[in-house]
Amino acid sequence: ECGHISVSAPIVHLGDPITASCIIKQNCSHLDPEPQILWRLGAELQPGGRQQRLSDGTQESIITLPHLNHTQAFLSCALNWGNSLQILDQVELRAGYPPAIPHNLSCLMNLTTSSLICQWEPGPETHLPTSFTLKSFKSRGNCQTQGDSILDCVPKDGQSHCSIPRKHLLLYQNMGIWVQAENALGTSMSPQLCLDPMDVVKLEPPMLRTMDPSPEAAPPQAGCLQLSWEPWQPGLHINQKCELRHKPQRGEASWALVGPLPLEALQYELCGLLPATAYTLQIRCIRWPLPGHWSDWSPSLELRTTERAPTHHHHHHHH
């Protein structure tokens, strides 16, 4: 190995200067006594190398690149060798930015998977390998005093979410949670969340059903629909409020919202709809009056309202 490059820093802020030195050992006797060291960044020759012979007989060339505007490039030092360029050594240079503060950190408790799932926005591209770690601790109070640390949660590459499993959670107790971003240029931390996992619980939605007509019950009036729902059993003991949305299947009508409905209603007569019209309906619920997240909308139920009553009965609807 005849040559060796050393750099002021292999990773710098994008646009910052970088200084490199290439030293050629004296015992490389096959070289010219006064070889001219050339510099190349990627495929481009770089002027401005200052060359000198050191007291021990080695040759040194120093170059300063005033602005490294490539996020990744190879810097090499070389000699002319016959008609070709002989590479003596090369180093990889990286340029980018320190991580921005991760923002919009939010979490939800999934009672089915028994895990607290947190997600965040990582901020602008750093152009450098950047690791994110979800850090947390248990706290008896409002997270001012730190209790036991919880094992760091490291997302899979490229993901901006992480799941803390049940064994690391304490329900009905606060946890301090934040995201730490780290790369070669620095470290940043998101603002800390302080939350009780149960206060960010996201329930599964109920299943909508048509109400089985019973012999003694009156059939629905024109423009009305009778429906019922089967609550998600594991969430049954959590007080909730629910809301329905509906729209005609045909046409461009937007969803109309009906609510709040208590989960316990379990059945509902929806009126004021167009007669003889097919409707799509969905329901969702949220823990209430305690804090929580809305469930997803349930799978759709499709129902048709009955025909309008004959004209000679029309006056009954006004009483």
Partner: antibody, heavy 118, light 107 residues
Framework: EVQLLESGGGLVQPGGSLRLSCAAS????????MGWVRQAPGKGLEWVSS????????PYADSVKGRFTISRDNSKNTLYLQMNSLRAEDTAVYYC???????????WGQGTLVTVSS | DIQMTQSPSSLSASVGDRVTITCRAS??????LNWYQQKPGKAPKLLIY???NLQNGVPSRFSGSGSGTDFTLTISSLQPEDFATYYC?????????FGGGTKVEIK
């Protein structure tokens, strides 16, 4: 401090009726599911029935369905179990319990003994 | 209905022993598994809920683990006051069901 106090147990003949009460204090009764669990002498625990916070949902064990009725009066902070057509196998200590959001029975009363015998 | 099978039905142990009780559900119940302690003539007392959460006031020598169908209650160092009967209960869906109980006796 949460307290649950059952009453209404006693000796009753087969086919007879009994109404158990559970007076609750120390928490906002109207916000919680409540339930009844029984334990026959020398046996394990058996869930009997539960009731939602406003009384709209009332699941029952198959063994008591159609014979027992659970109810609550939120204005009186009281849970009830009306037991009709009683059988010898209904003999047990009956406990009332306050349920948590995950179905756990967080607090229990001291129990009241129901004996069905001729 | 979901059947809950507890084992062993009884065990003898000494003060200071590590004791493990298992509970198996006949179908998956996620983490909806609760553990209770009952002493003779007394009402049951909640120890662990949602498989691994220690109820307030319960000593930290009690711990719970497992999910799906297989669950464990562990007493890390048995104390004189821990001799009792222990029950598991699933609250995943109705009807709620209890295990048959495990009686922990003094060796």
């Amino acid at each position: 401090e949460v307290q649950l106090l059952e009453s209404g147990g006693g000796l009753v003949q087969p086919g007879g009726s009994l109404r158990l009460s559970c007076a609750a204090s120390g928490f906002t009764f109207s916000l919680y599911w409540m339930g009844w669990v029984r334990q026959a002498p020398g046996k394990g625990l058996e869930w009997v029935s539960s009731i939602s916070s406003s009384g709209g949902v009332t699941p029952y064990a198959d063994s008591v369905k159609g014979r027992f009725t659970i109810s609550r009066d939120n204005s009186k902070n009281t849970l009830y179990l009306q037991m009709n057509s009683l059988r010898a196998e209904d003999t047990a200590v009956y406990y009332c319990a306050k349920l948590g959001e995950l179905g756990q029975m967080v607090y229990w009363g001291q129990g009241t003994l129901v004996t069905v015998s001729s | 209905d979901i059947q809950m099978t507890q084992s062993p039905s009884s065990l003898s142990a000494s003060v200071g022993d590590r004791v493990t009780i298992t509970c198996r559900a006949s179908q998956g119940i996620s983490s909806y598994l609760n553990w209770y302690q009952q002493k003779p003539g007394k009402a049951p007392k909640l120890l662990i809920y949602y498989a691994s959460n220690l109820q307030n006031g319960v000593p930290s020598r009690f711990s719970g683990s497992g999910s799906g169908t297989d669950f464990t209650l562990t007493i890390s160092s048995l104390q004189p006051e821990d001799f009792a009967t222990y029950y598991c209960q699933q609250s995943f869906k109705y009807p709620m069901t209890f295990g048959g109980g495990t009686k922990v006796e003094i060796k």
